[in-house]
C-alpha cells in the first residue's frame, strides 16, 4: 500500500480542503472511525487500484486516525493496513468528544490503561488531574491517544489552555473490580468415613467478590437435597467458602462431590471434584511386599519400613521374638509411625549400630477396633568376612598344605590363588586361581560350620600342594555379600632351608 502524503502525522488548517490518496495491487479503501467515508475508487491500466479521499471544509472534529486498507483482504498474503493521523487545530473545539462508554473504564487486574482525552492541536499542553485536585499528575501524554499509565479507582479530568481560556475535558471514571480467573479448591475433613460418621466438605474461592456455588453429590441425584452454608472468611479478603455437611453418612453417599463456581462479570467458571468413600467398617491393609528374610549389616544402622493403609488411625506395635519393642533409652532402637496421607501410614523400626543379638523374628502389628494386620520377617545380621588364620605346614606325606580359616555371615565363599613369579606378582601379574580338578597340582578340602551363638559361618579350607619346586605366593580370599578379606603366605620348596 502506498499513501500520499505518507504521514504518519499531518497537521492541516481549519476550513481547508485536503486530498488523501491510497494505492495498491488490490482494491483499497479509506476507513475513519470504523466507517468508510465517501471516496473515489479507480483501477489504472497497469492494474493498480487506488482510492482518493477528499476532506473538505476541515474542522477540529476531523482530527483523528485514518486507515487505508485492502477492500477485501481475503486471499491476500498480508492483512496490510496503513495508518495516518490528522490534526486540525481548531480553537472552537476543546477536547474531542468521547462516547459515553469511553468515560467509564473498568479494570479487573492491575494493568496500564489510557484515559483518551485528545485535542485538535499537537502543540497544546495537556495535563491530567484528579477530578477534585489542581495538581497535575506525572503521567505521560500522547496527543494521538491520551494519558497512559496505571491508575487508582478515582475520577480524572484533562485540562488544556487554548488561547487565554482554560478548557476541561469530561470526567473519566476508573473502576477496579475484584475479579480473577476463578480458582476453586475443594477439601474434605475426611475423604474416608465409616457409615454413621459425618461428611463435611469445603469449597473455597479466592479473589472474587461475587460468585455462585453449585454442589453436585450422590444424594442430590436421588432427590435428597442438602443445603450448603456460604460464608466469607473475614481474616482473608476475597475468600468465599461454601460448606456442604452431610450428617450420619450412608454407604450410598460414596462417590464424587463436585463444587461448581461461576462469576458473572467475566463469565468465568471453575469446578473441582473430590471422591468420598463411605465404608461399612474400618480397615487395615498392607501395601507392597516385604520379604520374609531381611538383612542388616553388623555395626551399621538399618531401617525396616512397612507401608499400610488404615481407617480409622490404628495403633502400631513392633515385636521381636514375641516381645514388645519400644524406643530404647540408649538410642539403640527407634520406632516411628508417620501418617503420609489421610489413610496411608509408614511405620519404621530403626536399629542403630546393629548387633548380632538383634537378629531374630520381627513382627509389626497395626490394629484398631474394626481390623488388624500383622507382618513378620526374619532379620539376618550380615557380618563382613575376615580371614582369621592362614598357615602353612609340611606333613610327612611330602606334600605341603596351606590352611585358611575365616568367618562371616552370610556364608563366605573361598577363593585360592597363587603367584609363581614373585618378582612380578602380585603387582604386575594377576594371581592364578587354584581349583579342585584332577589335573591340578593342588587339591582342596573345605568345611563349613554354623555357629549359632555368634550367628555366623566359619569356613576352614585346606589346600594341598603336590610338589612345590620354587617359592610360591598363595592367597586365600574370603568373600560374602558384605565384604572380602585376603591373606597371603609364601610357600617354599622342602629343599630350601629358609622361609620368606
Amino acid at each position: 500500500l502506498v499513501v500520499t502524503p505518507p504521514g504518519p502525522e499531518l497537521v492541516l488548517n481549519v476550513s481547508s480542503t485536503f486530498v488523501l490518496t491510497c494505492s495498491g495491487s488490490a482494491p483499497v479503501v479509506w476507513e475513519r472511525m470504523s466507517q468508510e467515508p465517501p471516496q473515489e475508487m479507480a483501477k489504472a491500466q497497469d492494474g493498480t487500484f487506488s482510492s482518493v479521499l477528499t476532506l473538505t471544509n476541515l474542522t477540529g472534529l476531523d482530527t483523528g486516525e485514518y486507515f487505508c486498507t485492502h477492500n477485501d483482504s481475503r486471499g491476500l498474503e498480508t492483512d496490510e493496513r496503513k495508518r495516518l493521523y490528522i490534526f486540525v487545530p481548531d480553537p472552537t473545539v476543546g477536547f474531542l468528544p468521547n462516547d459515553a462508554e469511553e468515560l467509564f473504564i473498568f479494570l479487573t487486574e492491575i494493568t496500564e490503561i489510557t484515559i483518551p482525552c485528545r485535542v485538535t492541536d499537537p502543540q497544546l499542553v495537556v495535563t491530567l488531574h484528579e477530578k477534585k485536585g489542581d495538581v497535575a499528575l506525572p503521567v505521560p501524554y500522547d496527543h494521538q491517544r491520551g494519558f497512559s499509565g496505571i491508575f487508582e479507582d478515582r475520577s480524572y479530568i484533562c485540562k488544556t489552555t487554548i488561547g487565554d481560556r482554560e478548557v476541561d475535558s469530561d470526567a473519566y471514571y476508573v473502576y477496579r473490580l475484584q475479579v480473577s480467573s476463578i480458582n476453586v479448591s475443594v477439601n474434605a475433613v475426611q475423604t474416608v468415613v465409616r457409615q454413621g460418621e459425618n461428611i463435611t466438605l469445603m469449597c473455597i474461592v479466592i479473589g472474587n467478590e461475587v460468585v455462585n456455588f453449585e454442589w453436585t453429590y450422590p444424594r442430590k441425584e436421588s432427590g435428597r437435597l442438602v443445603e450448603p452454608v456460604t460464608d466469607f472468611l473475614l481474616d482473608m479478603p476475597y475468600h468465599i467458602r461454601s460448606i456442604l455437611h452431610i450428617p450420619s453418612a450412608e454407604l450410598e453417599d460414596s462417590g464424587t462431590y463436585t463444587c461448581n463456581v461461576t462469576e458473572s462479570v467475566n463469565d468465568h467458571q471453575d469446578e473441582k471434584a473430590i471422591n468420598i468413600t463411605v465404608v461399612e467398617s474400618g480397615y487395615v491393609r498392607l501395601l507392597g511386599e516385604v520379604g520374609t528374610l531381611q538383612f542388616a549389616e553388623l555395626h551399621r544402622s538399618r531401617t525396616l519400613q512397612v507401608v499400610f493403609e488404615a481407617y480409622p488411625p490404628p495403633t502400631v506395635l513392633w515385636f521381636k521374638d514375641n516381645r514388645t519393642l519400644g524406643d530404647s533409652s540408649a538410642g539403640e532402637i527407634a520406632l516411628s509411625t508417620r501418617n503420609v496421607s489421610e489413610t496411608r501410614y509408614v511405620s519404621e523400626l530403626t536399629l542403630v549400630r546393629v548387633k548380632v543379638a538383634e537378629a531374630g523374628h520381627y513382627t509389626m502389628r497395626a490394629f484398631h477396633e474394626d481390623a488388624e494386620v500383622q507382618l513378620s520377617f526374619q532379620l539376618q545380621i550380615n557380618v563382613p568376612v575376615r580371614v582369621l588364620e592362614l598357615s602353612e605346614s609340611h606333613p610327612d606325606s611330602g606334600e605341603q598344605t596351606v590352611r585358611c580359616r575365616g568367618r562371616g555371615m552370610p556364608q563366605p565363599n573361598i577363593i585360592w590363588s597363587a603367584c609363581r613369579d614373585l618378582k612380578r606378582c602380585p603387582r604386575e601379574l594377576p594371581p592364578t586361581l587354584l581349583g579342585n580338578s584332577s589335573e591340578e597340582e593342588s587339591q582342596l578340602e573345605t568345611n563349613v560350620t554354623y555357629w549359632e551363638e555368634e550367628q555366623e559361618f566359619e569356613v576352614v579350607s585346606t589346600l594341598r600342594l603336590q610338589h612345590v619346586d620354587r617359592p610360591l605366593s598363595v592367597r586365600c580370599t574370603l568373600r560374602n555379600a558384605v565384604g572380602q578379606d585376603t591373606q597371603e603366605v609364601i610357600v617354599v620348596p622342602h629343599s630350601l632351608p629358609f622361609k620368606v
Epitope: 565363599n413 577363593i415 590363588s417 602380585p426 603387582r427 601379574l429 594377576p430 594371581p431 592364578t432 586361581l433 587354584l434 581349583g435 579342585n436 580338578s437 589335573e439 591340578e440 580370599t477 568373600r479 555379600a481 558384605v482 565384604g483 572380602q484
Partner: antibody
Framework: EVQLVESGGGVVQPGRSLRLSCAAS????????MHWVRQAPGKGLEWVTV????????YYADSVKGRFTISRDNSKNRLYLQMNSLRAEDTAVYYC???????????WGQGTMVTVSS | DIQMTQSPSTLSASVGDRLTITCRAS??????LAWYQQKPGKAPTLLIY???SLESGVPSRFSGSGSGTDFTLTISSLQPDDFATYYC????????FGQGTKLEIK
C-alpha cells in the same frame, strides 16, 4: 536394579586422550572388582584392564599397558578409564563389567563408543 | 598367556535343533570358564560360569560342561531368541575370550 552405565566416549585424534566413566548402581560397588572390556567394530571381545575391589591391584592387557590407567571412586560408585596416546587400533565399544576374582563378568554396561581417527 | 579357541566360527541351525559349541584352552584352566551371549548392538550377557553353573534367569536349555582344556556349550532346543554370537572366557590366569561363534538361522 543392578546397573552399569558408561559415558565419555567420542571421536578423538590419534595421540590424544579420553577419559571414560562407568556409574554403578543397585549393588555394593566397593565389594567388587571391576573390568573394562572392548570390542572393535565387527570383532570379538578383548579384556583390557581390571581393578581390585579396594583399588589395591590393577592389571592391564599388554596392548594398553603404559597408556591406559584404571581407577575407581568407591564413595561415588564410579569406575574410570584414562586413555592416553590413543591409536587407531583402540577404536572400539568399551564396556565396563563387574567381575570379582574367581567370578565371571555377571553385569555389563551398555557400552560407549570410542573412535580414534584423524 | 592362555589362548582360547572356539569352534566353529559360524554355525547355521534351525529352531528346535540341538547344538554344541566347543572351546579349547591352550593350557589347563580347571573349571574357570564362562560362556556369554551377545546380540548385535548389545552388551554380552553371562550364561554359564564355572564351566557348568547356569547363571540365574538363564533358560535351562543352555548347559555347559568340561574341565581342564576342553569345554562345550549346549543348547538343547534352539529358540528364535538364541540366534546371536557366543563367547567363551577363561578367568584362571588373567582374562581371555575366545574369538566367538556366530549362530545363524539356516
Amino acid at each position: 536394579e543392578v546397573q552399569l552405565v558408561e559415558s565419555g566416549g567420542g571421536v578423538v585424534q590419534p595421540g590424544r586422550s579420553l577419559r571414560l566413566s562407568c556409574a554403578a548402581s543397585g549393588f555394593t560397588f566397593s565389594n567388587y572388582g571391576m573390568h573394562w572390556v572392548r570390542q572393535a567394530p565387527g570383532k570379538g571381545l578383548e579384556w583390557v584392564t581390571v581393578i581390585w575391589y579396594d583399588g589395591s591391584y590393577k592389571y592391564y592387557a599388554d596392548s594398553v599397558k603404559g597408556r591406559f590407567t584404571i581407577s575407581r571412586d568407591n564413595s561415588k560408585n564410579r569406575l574410570y578409564l584414562q586413555m592416553n596416546s590413543l591409536r587407531a587400533e583402540d577404536t572400539a565399544v568399551y564396556y565396563c563389567a563387574r567381575g570379582e576374582l574367581g567370578d565371571a563378568f555377571d553385569i555389563w554396561g551398555q557400552g560407549t563408543m570410542v573412535t580414534v581417527s584423524s | 598367556d592362555i589362548q582360547m579357541t572356539q569352534s566353529p566360527s559360524t554355525l547355521s541351525a534351525s529352531v528346535g535343533d540341538r547344538l554344541t559349541i566347543t572351546c579349547r584352552a591352550s593350557q589347563s584352566i580347571s573349571t574357570w570358564l564362562a560362556w556369554y551371549q551377545q546380540k548385535p548392538g548389545k552388551a554380552p550377557t553371562l550364561l554359564i560360569y564355572k564351566a557348568s553353573s547356569l547363571e540365574s534367569g538363564v533358560p535351562s536349555r543352555f548347559s555347559g560342561s568340561g574341565s581342564g582344556t576342553d569345554f562345550t556349550l549346549t543348547i538343547s532346543s534352539l529358540q528364535p531368541d538364541d540366534f546371536a554370537t557366543y563367547y567363551c572366557q577363561q578367568y584362571k590366569t588373567s582374562w581371555t575370550f575366545g574369538q566367538g561363534t556366530k549362530l545363524e538361522i539356516k
